[in-house]
Structures are given as C-alpha cells and as structure tokens.
Interface confidence: low
C-alpha cells in the first residue's frame, strides 16, 4: 500500500499493527443510557486469490475476549451465537463485504461500558483488529420528555396533551409511557415515541401536577417531566357564578372518578343574581386560602379510585393566589423543572373537602 494512503490513517490514529490490515473507527463514543448510537467503521484486508469468492464475516468482540472461546457481541454470521447480554442490541450494521464494520448499539446499558475490537474472517484470511479499539461510554440519561398542550385548557372541555421523546431512536425498544394526573383523563393514540392523554380538567384541578413518565425497558431507565395546571378564573358567561368554598385554605379536592362527569360544572340560577358580590367574596377567600396553603404538602387520599390502572398517588402542591376575577393567576415557583399549564375556568363549584387523588394511566 502506498505510503500516501497510509498517512491519513496515521493522522486519524487508526492504523492497525499490520499495515496490510487496517481499520478506521472513532476511538471513543458516548451514548446515554437507554438510547442508541451508530458508530461508522471501515476496514481493509488483503484478499488472496483463493479467498476471493469466500463470504466476509465480521465480528465485534469485547476487549479481552478469546476468539476460540467467547462469543462476539455482534456479527453478520447467521449461525454464530452472540453474547446474551448484547443480543438484539448490538448489530453489525455495516456490510463487511463492502469493507464496512459500522456498529449499531440500541437500548444502551451501563454494563456496555468498555472497549470493543473488530475481527474479520474471509476463508483462510482471518484478522483481529486490536488497534484501534472502540471505547463505549454509557452516561446518565439526561434527556426528558416534552409535554405539549395545544392552547388553553378549559373545564369541561377535552384537550389532547402529547408527551413526546423525539430524541429517542427509532431502532430501540419502544418506550412505555405513564401519565400521572389528578384530573379526569383517558388515553389517546400513541406512536413509537409519543403518547396522547385526553384530559378533561375540572375547576378543582387547579395547582395539581401532571406527570409524563417514560420508561426505556430495554435498558431499565426512566425519565419524566411534570407540569403544573395553573387555574385562572375567567368568567365568560354572566349567568355563571363561582362558589368560593369555605376559605379554609385546605387543599383537599376529591378527584375520585377519572372518567366521571365534571363536578360542579353546572351552577344555580340563584347565584347569578349575586354575581358581583360573589366575585368579591371569591377574591377575599382565595387570597386568604392561598396564604394558608402555598407551600404545604398535605394530602388526604381517598380510597375510591377511578382510573383504569390507578396505582400511584402523588402529593398536591398548594394553589396559587388569584388576584382578580379576570386576571391571570401568578405561578408559584415550586421547582425549576416544573412547567405550568393554564386552565381557564368559566365557572366552578368545588367541594369543601378538597383532597386530590392522583391516577396513573399507563400506555405500552
């Protein structure tokens, strides 16, 4: 091989010990736990005339593996057993007959950390490329799902919330989505990397958390995002009043039935006569309640559950103060990772006992 052809390989640090056999691959690759990576790889080997028509088999081995004894982590040889731990996750994606040794890793696991070397076999021509080796580093999963809310949430009106993990790869095991919500919900359609939750918020869902949890079962790792439903009182119907509750500041909204009717959606005609007066009462009581409740984490969960798969309960964060009948409610900074969603309430009639019970909806 001319020296000029070898220079770029030397520069890349990719020259194997035998100049007739060389391999070019990045020496280090980092992948987050549960995710995937495709490592481009090219190799070269001399082809004696007697091996010209032999099939080319490629193998990736973990460093220290003994060829005669240990199975590879990936190969294109169909009858070759591979390591149980990497089966289906490590693939020799490149075509060795075209000098391509590219390796695909999906559902990366912590124990995939380590170095790997490539071996080729073509008839009697066999060679293990011990240098360079590919070093795989598996790091913490830092990506988190996105929750998309189209427009404003209004009580009694169903909206589709989408939880997506667009950063996940297509080739990996499809993730398992779990939703945790106090509001009445049902599951909508899902794609490989997104799940839709149909939410029908009620007035008492103000200040409650909605969490989308995504589990990458192939690696046994979970990530989640929580948003907070932030209630604002925007009366649009002059005949609709707001019942203020007892002003105790207790956050004990019962949300027993997830697929049930929206509690307190109807209001009596009598309240309409006292609309302005009630607005002032609401203002006063909500201020008082907010001062008492913000920062508390009390829960009084009820046993009546209503989600198809009600498994998990979560503590309720305190509601935020509402300063006027029509103004937007300021949000309380509970967690820098907490995101807020707005609910516009045309009318409300919360129960005095307001302990919120959360339901989990799981989609697979």
């Amino acid at each position: 091989m001319p020296l000029l052809l070898l220079l770029p390989l030397l520069w890349a640090g990719a020259l194997a010990m035998d100049p007739n056999f060389w391999l070019q691959v990045q020496e280090s690759v980092t992948v987050q736990e549960g995710l995937c990576v495709l490592v481009p790889c090219t190799f070269f080997h001399p082809i004696p005339y007697y091996d010209k028509n032999s099939p080319v088999h490629g193998y990736w081995f973990r460093e220290g593996a003994i060829i005669s004894r240990d199975s590879p982590v990936a190969t294109n040889k169909l009858d070759q057993e591979v390591q149980e731990e990497t089966q289906g996750r490590f693939r020799l994606l490149g075509d060795p007959s075209r000098n391509n040794c590219s390796l695909s890793i999906v559902d990366a696991r912590r124990r995939d950390n380590g170095s790997y070397f490539f071996r080729m076999e073509r008839g009697s021509t066999k060679y293990s490329y011990k240098s360079p080796q590919l070093s795989v580093h598996v790091t913490d999963l830092t990506h988190r799902p996105k929750i998309l809310i189209p427009g404003t949430l209004e009580p009694g009106h169903s909206k589709n919330l989408t939880c997506s993990v667009s950063w996940a790869c297509e080739q990996g095991t499809p993730p398992i989505f779990s939703w945790l919500s106090a509001a009445p919900t049902s599951l909508g359609p899902r794609t490989t990397h997104s799940s839709v939750l149909i939410i029908t918020p009620r007035p008492q869902d103000h200040g409650t958390n909605l969490t989308c949890q995504v589990k990458f079962a192939g690696a046994g790792v979970t990530t989640e995002r929580t948003i907070q439903l932030n209630v604002t009182y925007v009366p649009q119907n002059p005949t609709t009043g707001i019942f203020p509750g007892d002003g105790s500041g207790k956050q004990e909204t019962r949300a027993g039935v997830v697929h049930g009717a929206i509690g307190g959606a109807g209001v009596t005609a009598l309240l309409a006569l006292c609309l302005c007066l009630i607005f002032f009462i609401v203002k006063t009581h909500r201020r008082k309640a907010a001062r008492t409740a913000v920062g508390r984490n009390d829960t009084h969960p009820t046993t009546g559950s209503a989600s198809p798969k009600h498994q998990k309960k979560s503590k309720l964060h305190g509601p935020t103060e509402t300063s006027s009948c029509s103004g937007a409610a300021p949000t309380v900074e509970m967690d820098e990772e907490l995101h807020y969603a707005s609910l516009n309430f045309h009318g409300m009639n919360p129960s005095k006992d307001t302990s919120t019970e959360y339901s989990e909806v799981r989609t697979q």
Epitope: G64, A65, I66, S68, R69, E85, R111
Partner: antibody, heavy 120, light 107 residues
C-alpha cells in the same frame, strides 16, 4: 488498591455444603469476570469456576459441574461459591481471582485463600 | 481439555544463575498463556500474560516467550526472592487449565 478477601471455609463432612464468599474492593467489580481456583494440599492449581462481570455467563470445571454454583452480587461487590455434595477430593485452599478482562482470562489479582476440609 | 506439561518439575539453581522453565501445551493455545509465581503460604502472583508481556510491577529479569504449543519463562539472574513454584496457565479454551508447576529451589 485491589483487595480480595475470601471467607466461609472450614471443616465439613462428605456430602455436606459450604458457601464461600469473596469481598472485593479497589476496582469496578461489575466490569470484570471473576473465578475460583483451588489448590489441594501439596498440589498444583486447579481452576474451578468463572463468572462474567454481569453474572450472565458462568463456567465450571467438569469435576464440580452440577455440584458447585458460582454467583455474584455486584451491589455488594461480592463473589460466591455454593458448594454442595462435597467430596474428600474437594479439600483445598480456595482462591478468589480477578480476571484481567471482562471474560475469564488470566488472573491479575488473587485473594489469600480460604481452606475447605472435607472429612468425616 | 488442554493439558499443560511443565518441565522440569524441580530446578535447583544458585542465586545469580539463569533459570529456564518450560511449558508445553497439548495443542496450540496461540499466545494465550500466563505465568504465575507462588511462594509457600501465599497466593499466586501474575508474572507474564499473553506469553510475553510482563505484568505491572514485575522486574525485567522475568521474561516470557513462545507461541502455539511451546513456551518458556526465563529468569535472567535469580534473586533470593525468586525461589518459588512457577505455574503456567492457558486461557485459549475452556476449561482454563494450569500446568503442574516447576519448583525453583536453591542449590
């Protein structure tokens, strides 16, 4: 500093059972294969069993297959050897040894050994 | 299984002398052979791996050579602490096997 400390040896009657432990420190335990190697009094070394770093693969010498079980608890950095149906010929010092690489190869670190005596 | 035969069984030499220990495999083990040193009452200690590579902290007077079926451990000039039993081990095939050992004793 890599350290391997065996325990659990002792005197046991033929047909009896014993469980050896090997506490490891000074290296990332889960990344390396581990083995048990024994040495009968005044004799040479005999490899007994090996286990891969994750515990997913195990290997045994024919002389102990079906009687001994190797296992590991990576959360405790501990290697185990459960020995059942013990015979007089199992009498030996049992060493816990760390493989240099992920799968069983040569051994770069050894424990000090624990003596197992099988006698009636 | 691969049988490793070490010779001689005992080697009587004086400090400063050269020691040559042999290990022969019943079939080729390529270069997948290691050498260990064991002193009475102690655990074995790795000297050489992959037939010719010295392990960390092993003095340069120890060297290994050979491939296939014939291997040699050479101690260029014996020090008093080198008198011990030496074992070879192959890791090319399961089961892993050791040679019977060569005892290097003071003459």
């Amino acid at each position: 500093e890599v350290q391997l400390l065996e325990s659990g040896g002792g005197l046991v009657q033929p047909g009896g059972s014993l469980r050896l432990s090997c506490a490891a420190s000074g290296f990332t335990f889960s990344s390396y294969a581990m083995s048990w190697v024994r040495q009968a009094p005044g004799k040479g070394l005999e490899w007994v069993s090996a286990i891969s770093g994750s515990g997913g693969s195990t290997y045994y010498a024919d002389s102990v297959k079906g009687r001994f079980t190797i296992s590991r608890d990576n959360s405790k950095n501990t290697l185990y050897l459960q020995m059942n149906s013990l015979r007089a010929e199992d009498t030996a010092v049992y060493y816990c040894a760390k493989s240099r690489y992920y799968y069983g190869d040569y051994f770069d670190y050894w424990g000090q050994g624990t003596l197992v005596t099988v006698s009636s | 299984e691969i049988v490793l035969t070490q010779s001689p069984a005992t080697l009587s030499l004086s400090p400063g002398e050269r020691a040559t220990l042999s290990c022969r495999a019943s079939q080729s083990v390529s270069s997948y052979l290691a050498w260990y040193q064991q002193k009475p009452g102690q655990a074995p200690r790795l000297l050489i791996y992959d037939a010719s590579n010295r392990a960390t902290g092993i003095p340069a007077r120890f060297s290994g050579s050979g491939s296939g079926t014939d291997f040699t451990l050479t101690i260029s000039s014996l020090e008093p602490e080198d008198f011990a039993v030496y074992y070879c081990q192959q890791y090319y095939f399961w089961p892993l096997t050791f040679g019977g050992g060569t005892k290097v004793e003071i003459k």
